[in-house]
């Protein structure tokens, strides 16, 4: 029995003076305690608690129930402990079957003996089932066995308590062991759509999927830089013992522009923190933006081809396009299709091909596009290069030559005399009188030029040439004269390709 | 680190008795248990009987079971066994085992101990 100094209280003293008794079944369990400010007996068993305000706590037959420790308290607080064993070889065991285990972390199956003397007190599996190699234990026959370090392959493991009477195995009710999964790494948080873009009044939905050992983990939505509480509805499942996914939805049933800005989805476990954002934004009405991917002047070569390209952002959806040229939709020679098959695209490309173009093919050329919103368009001027033609070559009236032709870019017109029978014209002549004329074909036709010479210049028979010429190439026209005594006469103009 | 040390072995008389000892030095706790194994020459190392650091409770093989009994004394780091009745085919090298870790599942798996002491021989004549 404990012994204080005089003077300070305390702890009652117990009757039988022992930590532990046993007694049989049925015998009297009689405990006495003896203090002066006595206040209350408290029976404590497994979940299981009585209280007596007598000093003397009888129990006439003794049941295997009264088995646990019987603490006598004064009014100081202090209180003194016996633990009663009432060993009854028909119970050997009392039972609490719940049975929950923290991985890593011990837990107690709470199997107290009636008779703390027997032996190869221990655990068994069920229906001679094997328990795990690894699992250990610590025995204490007032509360039952401690597994040591929980695992996470222990849970749903069916096991007994069990101990050695007369040289056979006595086995407890049965206990399932339910593991609570211990958080080892950060929750998976992953986002239906990384980003939104929708117009004022309509719904924004944005899912975002938790994933973890167990239904403890904490998720919430939260808007950056904003304390405001979101509203969110949650969907839950567990996929087998240790796979727990939860659907955490947000809602804004109609968005406006103000709403815009990042979303964020955070989760956490007591491992650490794991978190995903989405990013809506919301414009007032619909847009088409279009960015051409060539110079929109083009310049091509005769009977080339080129490739009007043009990449367009368009919110909602583009309805319709179309290319046009000279008011005429082009039916074919074009595709149309999306930058991204990802869900939240709204960048497109359109490509119009245009093949073996001709001189006469030069022109604008517009893409339109529209969505339930918006009309844009987009103007590509394109120029077709082409090598001169001599339209007209002749001999006026007023004895002037005069040579017209037409090219794109505008062609450049020299003239040449060469005397007698030589073909090479080297000596040049300047013209009297040069003229841009104005075509009448479109405006990105090809460009006329006129040059005249006075041929009273010329006193020998010979030949004089007109050369028209520009960046693609040059062709030339020629002019025999001979002189019969004092006339001077035109032979036969002819023109000669020069390549 | 434990360190095991056996004492107690010797030629005892069938019927005789034998007390053996394994004191233990290093940290023991709440966790550990302490076990006597046996092995005869030509056989596997087989479990005789363990305790409890922390209760007290013991465990026994089937074939000692009522002659011999385990105890421990806390203070002096010691476990005894008590070999009563002993027979013929009791005779083998005792080994003292330990292990921090709590009792095993299957505490007669020599296989599950950490520790281990050098053994006694005790030899039982007819």
């Known amino acids: 029995q404990p012994s204080v100094s005089p003077g300070e209280p305390s702890p009652p003293s117990i009757h039988p003076g022992k930590s532990d008794l046993i007694v049989r079944v049925g015998d009297e369990i009689r405990l006495l305690c003896t203090d002066p400010g006595f206040v209350k007996w408290t029976f404590e068993i497994l979940d299981e608690t009585n209280e007596n305000k007598q000093n003397e706590w009888i129990t006439e037959k003794a049941e295997a129930t009264n088995t646990g420790k019987y603490t006598c308290t004064n009014k100081h607080g202090l209180s003194n402990s016996i633990y009663v064993f009432v060993r009854d070889p028909a119970k050997l065991f009392l039972v609490d079957r719940s049975l929950y285990g923290k991985e890593d972390n011990d837990t107690l199956v709470r199997c107290p003996l009636t008779d703390p003397e027997v032996t190869n007190y221990s655990l068994k599996g069920c229906q001679g089932k094997p328990l795990p190699k690894d699992l250990r234990f610590i025995p204490d026959p007032k509360a039952g066995i401690m597994i040591k370090s929980v695992k996470r392959a222990y849970h749903r493991l069916c096991l007994h308590c069990s101990v050695d009477q007369e040289g056979k195995s006595v086995l407890s009710e049965k206990f399932i062991l339910k593991v609570r999964p211990a958080f080892k790494a950060v929750p998976v948080v992953s986002v239906s759509k990384a980003s939104y873009l929708l117009r004022e009044g309509e719904e924004f939905t944005v899912t975002c999927t938790i994933k973890d050992v167990s239904s403890s983990v904490y998720s919430t939505w939260k808007r950056e830089n904003s304390q405001t509480k979101l509203q969110e509805k949650y969907n839950s499942w567990h996929h087998g013992d240790f796979n727990y996914e939860r659907q955490a939805t947000l809602t804004i049933s109609s968005a406006r522009v103000n709403d815009s800005g990042v979303f964020m989805c955070y989760a956490n476990n007591t491992f650490g923190s794991a978190n995903v954002t989405t990013t809506l934004e919301v414009v007032d009405k619909g847009f088409i933006n279009i960015f051409p991917m060539i110079n929109t002047t083009v310049f091509v070569n005769d009977g080339e081809n080129v490739d009007l390209i043009v990449e367009y952002e368009a919110f909602p959806k583009p309805e319709h396009q179309q290319w046009i040229y000279m008011n005429r939709t082009f039916t074919d020679k074009w595709e149309d299709y999306p930058k991204s098959e990802n869900e939240s695209n709204i960048r497109y490309v359109s490509e119009l091909h245009l093949t073996r173009l001709k001189g006469t093919e030069g022109g604008t050329y517009t893409f339109l596009v529209s969505n339930s919103d918006v009309n844009a368009a987009i103007a590509f001027n394109v120029y077709v290069n082409t090598k001169p033609e001599i339209l007209t070559y002749d001999r006026l009236v007023n004895g002037m030559l005069q040579c017209v032709a037409a090219g794109f870019p505008e062609p450049t017109i020299d003239w040449y005399f060469c005397p007698g029978t030589e073909q090479r014209c080297s000596a040049s002549v300047l013209p009297v009188d040069v003229q841009t004329l104005n075509s009448s074909g479109p405006p990105f036709g090809k460009l006329v030029v006129q040059s005249s010479i006075d041929s009273s210049a010329f006193k020998h028979n010979g030949t004089v040439e007109c050369k028209a010429y520009n960046d693609v190439g040059k062709t030339s026209a020629y002019f025999n004269f001979a002189f019969k005594g004092n006339n001077k006469e035109q032979i036969h103009p002819h023109t000669l390709f020069t390549p | 680190e434990v360190q095991l040390v056996e004492s107690g072995g010797g030629l005892v008389q069938a019927g005789g008795s034998l007390r053996l000892s394994c004191a233990a030095s290093?940290?023991?706790?709440?966790?550990?248990?302490m076990g006597w194994f046996r092995q005869a020459p030509g056989k596997e190392r087989e479990f005789v009987a363990a305790?409890?650091?922390?209760?007290?409770?013991?465990y026994y093989a089937d074939s000692v079971k009522g002659r011999f009994t385990i105890s421990r004394d806390n203070a002096k780091n010691t476990v005894y066994l008590q070999m009563n009745s002993l027979k013929p085919e009791d005779t083998a090298v005792y080994y003292c085992a330990a292990d921090q870790r709590g009792v095993p599942a299957y505490y007669s798996d020599y296989a599950l101990y950490d520790y281990w002491g050098q053994g006694t021989q005790v030899t039982v004549s007819s």
């Open positions: 290093g940290r023991t706790s709440g966790s550990y248990v």
């Open positions: 305790i409890s650091w922390s209760a007290g409770m013991t």
